[in-house]
C-alpha cells in the first residue's frame, strides 16, 4: 500500500480501467451471444 | 533518502544513463519522479515511473528519455544529448499523504558540449 | 500537457510584509497542486500539497488557496530566510495531463 498522493489518484485510476474493461468484455460477450442465437 | 549519480561532461548525441539509488522506502510503494534545472533557469518535469513501473512523460521529453527501475534504483537515460539538456537533474519520491512530505537527492549535473 | 503560468517572475518586499504568488493552470485541475521552495544550490522543498494543505514542518506563515485553475501562494510576516524561489506544480491525472511545474517566482526579502 502507498500513501503517495500521486500513486493513490492513479491507483484508482487503474481500478478504473480494469472495470471498463470486464464491462466491455462481458458485453461484448452477451452481444456476440445474442448474434449467435438470432 | 535519493542520491542521484552519473552525471558528467558528454558529447552531443552520446547516450547517457543517470541513476537514483533509494533506501528506507519501497519503489514498490512510491512513484518516482525526474525533474531537471538548466543554469539560473526553472524547474522542469520530465516523466513518472509508477510502484507498478508504468512511465509517463512530458510532451517534449518523449523519445528523448526512458525511465525505468530495478528495487532500489531509478534510471534516466537521456538517448541523445543536446546542449539544450545541459541541466543538474533531479530525482525525488513523490509526496506522501501521512507523512506530508517528499524526498529529493541534491541532483547531479549533466554538461553537453562538444 | 496542462501549462502551469505563475505570476509575478519577481517581487520584493520587506521584513515582516506580505507576498502573493498567483499560479494559473490552462484547465481545470481541481486542487491538484503542490508548492514548492527552492533556495540556491539546493533541491525544491516541498511547501503545501492538495492546493492547500501544509507539508511536515512547514511554518503557517505559507498559505495555499484556490482551485480548479487559480491558485494561490501567500506568506505573510516575511523573513529573510522566505528569500528563494517558489514554484508551483500540478499533479492531476498526470499518465494524460503532465505534471508541470509554473515558470517560477524570485521572492527578495529586503
Known amino acids: 500500500h502507498s500513501d503517495g498522493i500521486f500513486t493513490d489518484s492513479y491507483s484508482r485510476y487503474r481500478k478504473q480501467m480494469a472495470v471498463k474493461k470486464y464491462l466491455a468484455a462481458v458485453l461484448g460477450k452477451r452481444y456476440k451471444q445474442r448474434v449467435k442465437n438470432k | 533518502s535519493v542520491e542521484e549519480s552519473g552525471g558528467r561532461l558528454v558529447t552531443p548525441g552520446t547516450p547517457l544513463t543517470l541513476t537514483c539509488t533509494v533506501s528506507g522506502f519501497s519503489l514498490s510503494s512510491y512513484a518516482m519522479i525526474w525533474v531537471r534545472q538548466a543554469p539560473g533557469k526553472g524547474l522542469e518535469w520530465i516523466g513518472i515511473?509508477?510502484?507498478?513501473?508504468d512511465t509517463y512523460y512530458a510532451s517534449w521529453a518523449k523519445g528523448r528519455f526512458t525511465i525505468s527501475k530495478t528495487s532500489t534504483t531509478v534510471y534516466l537515460k537521456i538517448a541523445s544529448p543536446t546542449t539544450e539538456d545541459t541541466a543538474t537533474y533531479f530525482c525525488?519520491?513523490?509526496?506522501?499523504?501521512?507523512?506530508?512530505?517528499?524526498?529529493w537527492g541534491q541532483g547531479t549535473l549533466v554538461t553537453v558540449s562538444s | 500537457d496542462v501549462v502551469m503560468t505563475q505570476t509575478p517572475a519577481s517581487v520584493s518586499e520587506p521584513v515582516g510584509g506580505t507576498v502573493t504568488i498567483k499560479c494559473q493552470a490552462s484547465e481545470n485541475i481541481y486542487n491538484s497542486l503542490l508548492w514548492y521552495q527552492q533556495k540556491p544550490g539546493q533541491p525544491p522543498k516541498l511547501l503545501i500539497y492538495r492546493a492547500s494543505t501544509l507539508a511536515s514542518g512547514v511554518s503557517s506563515r505559507f498559505k495555499g488557496s484556490g482551485s480548479g485553475t487559480e491558485f494561490t501562494l501567500t506568506i505573510s510576516d516575511l523573513e529573510c530566510a522566505d528569500a528563494a524561489t517558489y514554484y508551483c506544480?500540478?499533479?492531476?491525472?498526470?499518465?494524460?495531463?503532465?505534471?508541470?511545474f509554473g515558470g517560477g517566482t524570485e521572492v527578495v526579502v529586503k
Open positions: 506544480q500540478n499533479y492531476y491525472n498526470i499518465w494524460t495531463n503532465g505534471a508541470a
Open positions: 525525488a519520491r513523490e509526496p506522501g499523504s501521512t507523512t506530508q512530505n517528499d524526498l
Open positions: 515511473i509508477y510502484d507498478n513501473g
